[in-house]
Protein backbone atom coordinates (compact mmCIF):
# COMPACT_ATOMS: atom_id res chain seq x y z
CA UNK A 1 0.00 0.00 0.00
CA UNK A 2 1.23 3.59 -0.61
CA UNK A 3 2.78 6.21 2.26
CA UNK A 4 -0.25 7.88 3.92
CA UNK A 5 -0.23 11.58 2.96
CA UNK A 6 2.65 13.68 4.93
CA UNK A 7 4.75 10.18 5.51
CA UNK A 8 6.01 10.21 1.66
CA UNK A 9 10.03 10.65 1.11
CA UNK A 10 9.33 14.10 0.51
CA UNK A 11 8.00 15.36 3.47
CA UNK A 12 11.12 13.47 5.17
CA UNK A 13 13.84 15.01 3.04
CA UNK A 14 12.12 18.41 3.71
CA UNK A 15 11.65 19.20 7.93
CA UNK A 16 11.96 22.86 7.14
CA UNK A 17 9.01 22.93 4.98
CA UNK A 18 6.09 24.79 6.14
CA UNK A 19 3.47 22.59 7.95
CA UNK A 20 -0.14 21.47 5.55
CA UNK A 21 -2.70 23.71 6.59
CA UNK A 22 -6.42 21.96 7.01
CA UNK A 23 -7.26 22.68 3.21
CA UNK A 24 -3.99 21.27 1.91
CA UNK A 25 -4.53 17.94 4.41
CA UNK A 26 -7.84 17.34 2.96
CA UNK A 27 -6.80 17.76 -0.63
CA UNK A 28 -3.66 15.30 -0.47
CA UNK A 29 -6.04 13.21 1.90
CA UNK A 30 -8.60 12.62 -0.78
CA UNK A 31 -5.93 12.61 -3.56
CA UNK A 32 -4.25 9.51 -1.65
CA UNK A 33 -7.41 7.93 -1.61
CA UNK A 34 -8.40 8.55 -5.34
CA UNK A 35 -4.68 6.88 -5.76
CA UNK A 36 -5.59 4.02 -3.91
CA UNK A 37 -8.72 3.50 -5.92
CA UNK A 38 -7.33 3.73 -9.16
CA UNK A 39 -4.85 0.71 -8.68
CA UNK A 40 -7.87 -1.20 -7.14
CA UNK A 41 -9.90 -0.35 -10.82
CA UNK A 42 -6.40 -1.62 -12.16
CA UNK A 43 -7.26 -5.37 -10.00
CA UNK A 44 -10.37 -5.19 -11.15
CA UNK A 45 -10.04 -4.20 -14.55
CA UNK A 46 -7.42 -7.09 -15.15
CA UNK A 47 -9.43 -9.73 -13.75
CA UNK A 48 -12.75 -9.11 -15.26
CA UNK A 49 -14.21 -7.20 -18.38
CA UNK A 50 -16.44 -5.08 -16.14
CA UNK A 51 -14.65 -1.94 -17.16
CA UNK A 52 -16.41 -2.00 -20.36
CA UNK A 53 -19.36 -4.13 -19.89
CA UNK A 54 -22.93 -2.23 -21.08
CA UNK A 55 -25.07 -4.18 -18.29
CA UNK A 56 -23.99 -1.68 -15.84
CA UNK A 57 -27.62 -0.65 -14.75
CA UNK A 58 -28.34 -4.23 -13.83
CA UNK A 59 -26.44 -4.00 -10.95
CA UNK A 60 -26.98 -0.58 -9.82
CA UNK A 61 -30.65 -0.80 -9.09
CA UNK A 62 -29.15 -3.28 -6.45
CA UNK A 63 -27.10 -0.07 -5.61
CA UNK A 64 -27.71 3.11 -3.74
CA UNK A 65 -24.31 4.90 -4.15
CA UNK A 66 -24.41 8.43 -3.34
CA UNK A 67 -23.95 11.04 -6.38
CA UNK A 68 -23.75 14.80 -6.75
CA UNK A 69 -26.54 16.62 -8.27
CA UNK A 70 -26.80 20.40 -8.67
CA UNK A 71 -29.23 20.46 -5.84
CA UNK A 72 -26.07 19.48 -2.82
CA UNK A 73 -24.34 23.08 -3.77
CA UNK A 74 -20.84 21.47 -4.89
CA UNK A 75 -21.09 22.62 -8.80
CA UNK A 76 -19.71 26.37 -9.49
CA UNK A 77 -23.32 27.44 -10.28
CA UNK A 78 -25.15 27.49 -7.22
CA UNK A 79 -22.02 26.86 -4.53
CA UNK A 80 -23.17 27.03 -0.77
CA UNK A 81 -20.51 25.77 0.84
CA UNK A 82 -21.90 24.53 4.29
CA UNK A 83 -24.68 22.74 2.25
CA UNK A 84 -21.80 21.08 0.20
CA UNK A 85 -19.79 20.40 3.16
CA UNK A 86 -22.97 18.55 4.77
CA UNK A 87 -23.60 16.90 1.35
CA UNK A 88 -19.73 15.75 0.78
CA UNK A 89 -19.29 13.96 4.60
CA UNK A 90 -23.02 12.23 4.45
CA UNK A 91 -21.81 10.48 1.45
CA UNK A 92 -18.87 9.89 2.81
CA UNK A 93 -20.24 8.28 5.78
CA UNK A 94 -22.45 6.48 3.07
CA UNK A 95 -19.99 4.92 1.20
CA UNK A 96 -18.57 3.30 4.28
CA UNK A 97 -20.40 -0.02 3.71
CA UNK A 98 -19.39 -0.46 0.70
CA UNK A 99 -15.87 0.11 0.97
CA UNK A 100 -16.54 -2.28 3.80
CA UNK A 101 -18.06 -4.79 1.02
CA UNK A 102 -14.92 -3.97 -0.96
CA UNK A 103 -12.63 -5.91 1.81
CA UNK A 104 -12.62 -8.91 0.67
CA UNK A 105 -13.09 -8.85 -3.34
CA UNK A 106 -9.02 -8.34 -4.11
CA UNK A 107 -6.41 -10.72 -3.61
CA UNK A 108 -3.26 -8.71 -4.53
CA UNK A 109 -4.28 -5.70 -3.46
CA UNK A 110 -6.26 -6.72 -0.33
CA UNK A 111 -3.60 -4.11 1.43
CA UNK A 112 -4.42 -1.50 -0.98
CA UNK A 113 -8.75 -1.65 0.48
CA UNK A 114 -7.75 -1.55 3.42
CA UNK A 115 -5.64 1.73 3.30
CA UNK A 116 -8.97 3.44 1.38
CA UNK A 117 -11.37 2.47 3.68
CA UNK A 118 -9.00 3.47 6.54
CA UNK A 119 -8.07 6.87 4.67
CA UNK A 120 -11.84 7.48 4.34
CA UNK A 121 -12.50 7.22 8.24
CA UNK A 122 -9.67 9.80 8.05
CA UNK A 123 -10.77 11.86 6.00
CA UNK A 124 -14.56 12.32 7.09
CA UNK A 125 -12.77 13.29 10.71
CA UNK A 126 -11.17 15.97 8.68
CA UNK A 127 -13.92 17.17 7.05
CA UNK A 128 -16.31 16.79 10.40
CA UNK A 129 -13.79 19.40 11.97
CA UNK A 130 -14.11 21.76 8.98
CA UNK A 131 -18.18 21.63 9.23
CA UNK A 132 -20.18 24.12 11.50
CA UNK A 133 -23.25 22.34 11.31
CA UNK A 134 -22.32 18.39 12.37
CA UNK A 135 -26.73 18.65 13.57
CA UNK A 136 -27.57 18.64 9.61
CA UNK A 137 -25.32 15.10 9.03
CA UNK A 138 -27.34 12.16 8.71
CA UNK A 139 -25.48 8.89 9.75
CA UNK A 140 -26.29 5.79 8.23
CA UNK A 141 -28.49 3.29 10.28
CA UNK A 142 -26.02 0.44 11.68
CA UNK A 143 -28.99 -2.61 10.94
CA UNK A 144 -30.29 -0.64 7.41
CA UNK A 145 -25.98 -1.27 6.21
CA UNK A 146 -25.90 -4.73 7.96
CA UNK A 147 -28.74 -6.16 5.67
CA UNK A 148 -27.14 -4.30 2.67
CA UNK A 149 -23.68 -5.64 3.03
CA UNK A 150 -25.41 -8.95 3.57
CA UNK A 151 -27.85 -8.25 0.59
CA UNK A 152 -24.65 -7.43 -1.59
CA UNK A 153 -22.47 -10.59 -0.15
CA UNK A 154 -25.23 -13.23 -1.73
CA UNK A 155 -25.33 -11.80 -4.75
CA UNK A 156 -23.83 -14.06 -7.62
CA UNK A 157 -20.17 -13.84 -8.79
CA UNK A 158 -20.59 -11.70 -11.93
CA UNK A 159 -23.12 -9.40 -9.97
CA UNK A 160 -20.53 -8.91 -6.90
CA UNK A 161 -18.36 -8.09 -9.86
CA UNK A 162 -20.26 -5.59 -11.16
CA UNK A 163 -20.83 -3.85 -7.57
CA UNK A 164 -16.88 -4.14 -6.97
CA UNK A 165 -16.55 -1.39 -10.33
CA UNK A 166 -19.85 0.33 -9.38
CA UNK A 167 -18.70 1.21 -6.01
CA UNK A 168 -15.22 2.35 -7.42
CA UNK A 169 -16.27 4.14 -10.05
CA UNK A 170 -18.41 5.90 -8.32
CA UNK A 171 -16.48 6.38 -4.75
CA UNK A 172 -13.86 7.84 -7.73
CA UNK A 173 -16.66 10.34 -8.68
CA UNK A 174 -17.98 11.11 -5.58
CA UNK A 175 -14.28 12.05 -4.38
CA UNK A 176 -13.39 13.69 -7.33
CA UNK A 177 -16.14 16.13 -7.71
CA UNK A 178 -15.64 17.01 -3.49
CA UNK A 179 -12.38 17.61 -4.20
CA UNK A 180 -13.16 20.57 -6.83
CA UNK A 181 -15.59 21.69 -4.43
CA UNK A 182 -13.32 22.05 -1.65
CA UNK A 183 -11.16 23.99 -3.34
CA UNK A 184 -13.49 26.26 -3.85
CA UNK A 185 -14.10 26.80 0.31
CA UNK B 1 -7.02 8.38 -34.46
CA UNK B 2 -7.21 10.73 -31.24
CA UNK B 3 -8.06 14.00 -32.09
CA UNK B 4 -10.73 16.95 -31.53
CA UNK B 5 -11.94 19.23 -34.35
CA UNK B 6 -14.12 22.52 -33.82
CA UNK B 7 -16.03 24.17 -35.73
CA UNK B 8 -18.73 26.58 -36.12
CA UNK B 9 -16.89 29.95 -35.70
CA UNK B 10 -16.94 32.98 -37.98
CA UNK B 11 -17.81 36.66 -37.73
CA UNK B 12 -20.69 37.73 -35.43
CA UNK B 13 -21.94 41.66 -34.02
CA UNK B 14 -21.83 42.51 -30.70
CA UNK B 15 -24.03 41.30 -28.29
CA UNK B 16 -24.86 38.19 -30.83
CA UNK B 17 -24.65 34.29 -30.05
CA UNK B 18 -22.69 31.84 -31.51
CA UNK B 19 -22.21 28.60 -30.74
CA UNK B 20 -18.83 26.35 -31.19
CA UNK B 21 -18.47 22.54 -31.68
CA UNK B 22 -16.08 20.16 -30.55
CA UNK B 23 -16.30 16.37 -32.25
CA UNK B 24 -13.77 14.27 -30.50
CA UNK B 25 -13.12 10.98 -31.62
CA UNK B 26 -10.36 7.93 -30.50
CA UNK B 27 -11.62 8.25 -26.84
CA UNK B 28 -14.98 9.37 -24.90
CA UNK B 29 -15.90 12.56 -23.55
CA UNK B 30 -17.70 10.91 -21.28
CA UNK B 31 -15.06 9.74 -18.85
CA UNK B 32 -12.65 12.65 -19.32
CA UNK B 33 -12.69 16.45 -18.45
CA UNK B 34 -12.77 18.75 -21.49
CA UNK B 35 -11.98 22.68 -21.50
CA UNK B 36 -12.22 25.49 -23.64
CA UNK B 37 -8.85 28.28 -24.15
CA UNK B 38 -9.00 30.82 -26.49
CA UNK B 39 -6.28 32.95 -28.03
CA UNK B 40 -7.38 36.44 -28.77
CA UNK B 41 -4.87 37.80 -32.12
CA UNK B 42 -1.15 38.17 -31.37
CA UNK B 43 -2.01 37.86 -27.31
CA UNK B 44 -1.46 34.92 -24.83
CA UNK B 45 -3.85 31.96 -23.88
CA UNK B 46 -7.05 32.12 -22.17
CA UNK B 47 -9.08 29.39 -20.08
CA UNK B 48 -12.21 29.95 -21.11
CA UNK B 49 -14.34 27.10 -19.26
CA UNK B 50 -14.20 23.15 -18.29
CA UNK B 51 -16.36 20.08 -18.12
CA UNK B 52 -16.02 17.25 -15.19
CA UNK B 53 -17.22 14.04 -17.23
CA UNK B 54 -18.93 13.48 -13.88
CA UNK B 55 -22.22 15.24 -13.44
CA UNK B 56 -21.76 17.62 -16.20
CA UNK B 57 -20.14 20.14 -13.81
CA UNK B 58 -18.83 23.05 -15.43
CA UNK B 59 -17.00 25.77 -14.02
CA UNK B 60 -15.83 28.93 -15.69
CA UNK B 61 -13.63 32.33 -15.90
CA UNK B 62 -14.92 35.42 -14.38
CA UNK B 63 -14.74 37.08 -17.94
CA UNK B 64 -17.30 34.91 -19.59
CA UNK B 65 -19.34 33.48 -16.66
CA UNK B 66 -23.13 34.47 -16.83
CA UNK B 67 -22.72 34.41 -21.26
CA UNK B 68 -20.97 31.37 -21.63
CA UNK B 69 -22.10 27.92 -21.56
CA UNK B 70 -20.62 24.59 -21.87
CA UNK B 71 -22.15 21.61 -22.50
CA UNK B 72 -21.79 18.23 -24.06
CA UNK B 73 -23.82 15.16 -26.21
CA UNK B 74 -22.51 12.13 -25.39
CA UNK B 75 -24.22 10.37 -27.98
CA UNK B 76 -22.26 12.05 -30.61
CA UNK B 77 -19.37 12.65 -28.72
CA UNK B 78 -19.10 16.24 -28.69
CA UNK B 79 -18.64 19.21 -26.66
CA UNK B 80 -20.20 22.50 -27.10
CA UNK B 81 -19.58 26.49 -25.81
CA UNK B 82 -22.58 28.43 -26.52
CA UNK B 83 -21.56 32.25 -26.47
CA UNK B 84 -24.08 34.87 -25.83
CA UNK B 85 -23.79 38.61 -25.23
CA UNK B 86 -20.45 38.22 -27.58
CA UNK B 87 -17.92 41.63 -26.81
CA UNK B 88 -15.24 42.58 -28.67
CA UNK B 89 -12.48 41.30 -26.39
CA UNK B 90 -14.57 37.76 -26.90
CA UNK B 91 -12.63 37.69 -30.61
CA UNK B 92 -10.43 34.63 -30.70
CA UNK B 93 -9.32 31.32 -31.61
CA UNK B 94 -10.76 28.80 -29.78
CA UNK B 95 -9.22 26.09 -28.82
CA UNK B 96 -11.21 22.81 -27.59
CA UNK B 97 -8.72 20.33 -25.31
CA UNK B 98 -8.64 17.41 -23.37
CA UNK B 99 -7.04 17.76 -19.89
CA UNK B 100 -5.33 14.54 -18.98
CA UNK B 101 -5.71 12.66 -16.30
CA UNK B 102 -8.30 12.24 -13.37
CA UNK B 103 -6.68 15.02 -11.30
CA UNK B 104 -6.59 17.42 -14.03
CA UNK B 105 -3.02 18.27 -13.88
CA UNK B 106 -2.03 19.09 -17.87
CA UNK B 107 -3.85 19.48 -21.45
CA UNK B 108 -2.48 16.73 -23.60
CA UNK B 109 -4.38 16.73 -26.37
CA UNK B 110 -5.67 20.20 -28.70
CA UNK B 111 -8.04 20.82 -31.42
CA UNK B 112 -7.11 22.89 -34.42
CA UNK B 113 -8.94 26.03 -33.52
CA UNK B 114 -11.91 28.01 -34.40
CA UNK B 115 -11.91 31.70 -34.68
CA UNK B 116 -14.42 33.54 -33.65
CA UNK B 117 -14.83 37.10 -34.66
CA UNK B 118 -17.08 39.76 -32.76
CA UNK B 119 -17.37 43.10 -34.75
CA UNK B 120 -20.25 45.66 -36.48
CA UNK C 1 -10.43 33.23 -10.84
CA UNK C 2 -6.68 32.20 -9.67
CA UNK C 3 -4.63 34.73 -11.34
CA UNK C 4 -1.29 33.49 -12.59
CA UNK C 5 1.68 35.98 -13.17
CA UNK C 6 4.51 35.03 -15.43
CA UNK C 7 8.00 36.65 -15.86
CA UNK C 8 9.51 38.34 -17.53
CA UNK C 9 7.17 39.13 -20.44
CA UNK C 10 10.01 38.62 -23.30
CA UNK C 11 13.26 37.56 -22.95
CA UNK C 12 16.46 37.96 -25.08
CA UNK C 13 18.63 34.67 -24.84
CA UNK C 14 21.35 33.26 -27.02
CA UNK C 15 21.92 29.20 -27.78
CA UNK C 16 23.77 27.66 -25.04
CA UNK C 17 22.52 29.93 -22.47
CA UNK C 18 20.79 28.58 -19.72
CA UNK C 19 17.42 30.73 -19.12
CA UNK C 20 14.61 30.37 -16.06
CA UNK C 21 10.92 31.81 -16.64
CA UNK C 22 9.07 32.33 -13.28
CA UNK C 23 5.22 31.64 -12.70
CA UNK C 24 3.34 33.16 -9.85
CA UNK C 25 -0.03 32.31 -8.26
CA UNK C 26 -2.20 34.21 -6.69
CA UNK C 27 -3.34 31.62 -4.14
CA UNK C 28 -1.64 28.01 -3.12
CA UNK C 29 -2.10 25.81 -5.50
CA UNK C 30 -0.02 23.00 -4.48
CA UNK C 31 1.87 21.47 -7.26
CA UNK C 32 -0.95 21.44 -9.81
CA UNK C 33 0.81 23.46 -12.21
CA UNK C 34 2.08 23.04 -15.95
CA UNK C 35 4.46 24.37 -18.47
CA UNK C 36 3.66 24.78 -21.77
CA UNK C 37 5.60 26.46 -25.12
CA UNK C 38 3.50 27.23 -28.37
CA UNK C 39 4.83 28.72 -32.01
CA UNK C 40 3.24 31.08 -33.80
CA UNK C 41 0.14 29.87 -35.42
CA UNK C 42 0.32 26.12 -33.96
CA UNK C 43 -1.45 24.39 -30.59
CA UNK C 44 0.40 24.70 -27.28
CA UNK C 45 2.66 21.63 -26.14
CA UNK C 46 3.41 20.45 -22.37
CA UNK C 47 6.72 20.64 -21.65
CA UNK C 48 6.13 19.95 -17.38
CA UNK C 49 3.52 18.87 -15.26
CA UNK C 50 2.67 18.63 -11.48
CA UNK C 51 5.42 21.18 -11.54
CA UNK C 52 8.38 19.13 -11.68
CA UNK C 53 7.08 16.29 -14.30
CA UNK C 54 8.90 16.17 -17.08
CA UNK C 55 6.43 14.94 -19.89
CA UNK C 56 7.49 12.13 -21.82
CA UNK C 57 9.54 13.11 -25.45
CA UNK C 58 10.59 16.24 -24.09
CA UNK C 59 14.11 17.26 -23.52
CA UNK C 60 16.18 17.04 -20.76
CA UNK C 61 17.06 20.55 -20.56
CA UNK C 62 13.78 21.62 -19.46
CA UNK C 63 13.26 21.56 -15.58
CA UNK C 64 10.50 22.78 -13.35
CA UNK C 65 10.37 23.55 -10.45
CA UNK C 66 8.18 25.01 -7.01
CA UNK C 67 5.36 24.30 -4.81
CA UNK C 68 1.93 26.60 -3.79
CA UNK C 69 2.40 29.92 -5.08
CA UNK C 70 6.03 30.28 -6.52
CA UNK C 71 7.29 28.18 -9.41
CA UNK C 72 10.36 28.22 -12.34
CA UNK C 73 10.74 26.65 -15.46
CA UNK C 74 14.27 26.60 -16.68
CA UNK C 75 15.80 25.43 -19.92
CA UNK C 76 19.66 24.74 -18.92
CA UNK C 77 21.62 25.21 -22.39
CA UNK C 78 19.23 26.83 -25.31
CA UNK C 79 18.66 25.27 -28.53
CA UNK C 80 17.54 26.89 -31.71
CA UNK C 81 14.40 25.35 -31.37
CA UNK C 82 13.84 26.41 -27.65
CA UNK C 83 12.60 30.37 -29.34
CA UNK C 84 9.41 29.97 -28.49
CA UNK C 85 6.42 31.55 -26.21
CA UNK C 86 6.12 29.66 -22.78
CA UNK C 87 3.03 29.55 -20.87
CA UNK C 88 2.20 28.24 -16.98
CA UNK C 89 -0.84 26.71 -16.34
CA UNK C 90 -2.62 26.04 -13.01
CA UNK C 91 -4.86 23.26 -12.83
CA UNK C 92 -5.82 23.41 -8.70
CA UNK C 93 -9.39 24.92 -10.11
CA UNK C 94 -9.98 25.81 -13.29
CA UNK C 95 -7.39 26.37 -15.85
CA UNK C 96 -5.90 29.67 -15.79
CA UNK C 97 -2.94 30.98 -17.70
CA UNK C 98 0.22 33.36 -17.11
CA UNK C 99 0.22 36.06 -20.20
CA UNK C 100 3.29 34.20 -21.38
CA UNK C 101 6.97 34.57 -21.58
CA UNK C 102 8.82 35.07 -25.53
CA UNK C 103 11.71 33.66 -25.68
CA UNK C 104 13.55 35.30 -28.40
CA UNK C 105 17.24 35.49 -29.66
CA UNK C 106 19.68 38.00 -28.99
Known amino acids: APVPPGEDSKDVAAPHRQPLTSSERIDKQIRYILDGISALRKETCNKSNMCESSKEALAENNLNLPKMAEKDGCFQSGFNEETCLVKIITGLLEFEVYLEYLQNRFESSEEQARAVQMSTKVLIQFLQKKAKNLDAITTPDPTTNASLLTKLQAQNQWLQDMTTHLILRSFKEFLQSSLRALRQM | EVQLVESGGGLVQPGGSLRLSCAASGFTISSNYMIWVRQAPGKGLEWVSD????????YYADSVKGRFTMSRDISKNTVYLQMNSLRAEDTAVYYCARWADDHPAWVDLWGRGTLVTVSS | DIQMTQSPSTLSASVGDRVTITCRAS??????LAWYQQKPGKAPKVLIY???TLESGVPSRFSGSGSGTEFTLTISSLQPDDFATYYCQQSWLGGSFGQGTKLEIK
Open chain 3, 27 to 32: QGISSW
Open chain 3, 50 to 52: KAS
Open chain 2, 51 to 58: LYYYAGDT
